[in-house]
């Protein structure tokens, strides 16, 4: 019961997080324009992965997606790449987890395959919730890089003037979503894990040996005294007899003048 | 590379009529504000009007009643419709425009200046 409940809480959890990483993905409020020393401005522009956006103290705003992939910085794409592998290994991990569910019954499905199924989607949640985390964390490292090292610069040109405006930018909300997604479907992975090693059936063969007893040859197996509560298969509390030698898988009960107790 | 192109400006009689235009181009992302300012003769620059992409206008008490700000969003071009012109209006009139290039590009582009002169 607990493996059920441990299992079933960990693709929850595992969901809300790959949830958060395709919101926080999709979101535009990654980046917002800092607005400290300007409190009042009438517009302030906000970035997200795909598109920026532009907002006034109206409310209205207008977005628009950029150009081209060759002219945005390498950490970006990195970024992209970063949480679409997270989103891409959330869902195929959602996939095999609900087949791995031990509450859902596929076929013949054995519980050694569902344990499998278990821990290769508790693995992939795992990784999805780290590349989530490490594709805000490069974001966020290159916000707080940028926050401090931004300068204003000016060119000329065509008789008019250009200047590349001192805007800082501060973490967006996007981040914070990521981060707790992340965290969400990590922590799930490692639910599903746990969850794994208790569907595992332990297969513990034992082999029985027979000992040779003195007067008698004897072969003993283990179990052959089935509780005297009367409860087992055995309620006879039968004891076995073979006179060879010979493996559990080998023996074989006859009636024998030797049937006593 | 943004640029921006005016043009417009000349001489008037006072009371007169003028419209500039000022056009954005090149790699626009976002235009987040266009206006003019001017500078007089001796003058520091002062602002004229500003348009924001949303539409909301801006005016300097000395020209509220008689210039009009209005903008083209499809053509990236702001015009400033200036009437009932005064002798006092008279300087060097300079676009501008605040825009995002890319992705946390943020530029202010200003153009040569356009002269406009009120005389009889």
């Known amino acids: 019961m607990a493996v059920t409940a441990c299992q079933g809480l960990g693709f929850v959890v595992s969901l809300i997080g790959i949830a958060g990483i395709i919101a926080a993905t999709c979101m535009d409020q990654w980046s917002t324009q800092d607005l400290y020393n300007n409190p009042v401005t009438a517009v302030f522009n906000y970035q997200g992965l795909w598109r920026s956006c532009v907002r006034e103290s109206s409310g209205f705003t207008e977005c628009r997606g950029y150009f081209t992939l060759l002219g945005l910085p390498a950490m970006l794409q990195a970024v992209r790449a970063l949480m679409i592998v997270g989103i891409v290994l959330g869902a195929i991990g959602l996939l095999v987890s609900i087949f791995a569910l031990k509450c859902i019954r596929i076929g013949s499905m054995e519980d050694s395959a569902k344990a499998n199924m278990t821990l290769t989607s508790g693995i992939m949640f795992i990784v999805s919730g780290l590349c989530a985390i490490a594709g805000v964390s490069v974001f966020a490292n290159m916000l707080v890089t940028n926050f401090w090292m931004s300068t204003a610069n000016m060119y000329t040109g065509m008789g008019g003037m250009v200047q590349t405006v001192q805007t800082r930018y501060t973490f967006g909300a996007a981040l914070f979503v990521g981060w707790v997604a992340g965290g969400l479907t990590l922590i799930g992975g490692v639910m599903m894990c746990i969850a794994c090693r208790g569907l595992a059936p332990e297969e513990t063969n034992y082999k029985a040996v027979s000992y040779h007893a003195s007067g008698h040859s004897v072969a003993y197996k283990p179990g052959g005294f089935k509780a005297s509560t009367g409860f087992g298969s055995n309620t006879k509390n039968k004891k076995i007899y073979d006179g060879g030698a010979r493996t559990e898988d080998e023996v074989q009960s006859y009636p024998s003048k030797h049937d006593y107790v | 590379q943004v640029q921006l192109v005016e043009s417009g400006g000349g001489l008037v009689q006072p009371g007169g009529s003028l419209r500039l235009s000022c056009a954005a181009s090149g790699s626009i992302l976002n235009l987040m504000t266009t206006g003019w300012y001017r500078q007089a003769p001796g003058k520091q620059r002062d602002l004229v009007a500003t348009?924001?992409?949303?539409?909301?206008?801006n005016y300097a008490d000395s020209v509220k009643g008689r210039f009009t700000i209005s903008r083209d969003k499809s053509k990236n071009t702001a015009y400033l419709q200036m009437d009932n012109l005064k002798p006092e209006d008279t300087a060097v009139y300079f676009c501008?425009?605040?825009?995002?290039?890319?992705?946390?590009?943020?530029?202010?582009?200003w153009d040569a200046g356009t002269q406009v002169t009120v005389s009889s």
């Open positions: 348009i924001t992409f949303g539409g909301t206008t």
């Open positions: 501008y425009a605040d825009v995002i290039v890319g992705f946390q590009d943020r530029r202010v582009a």
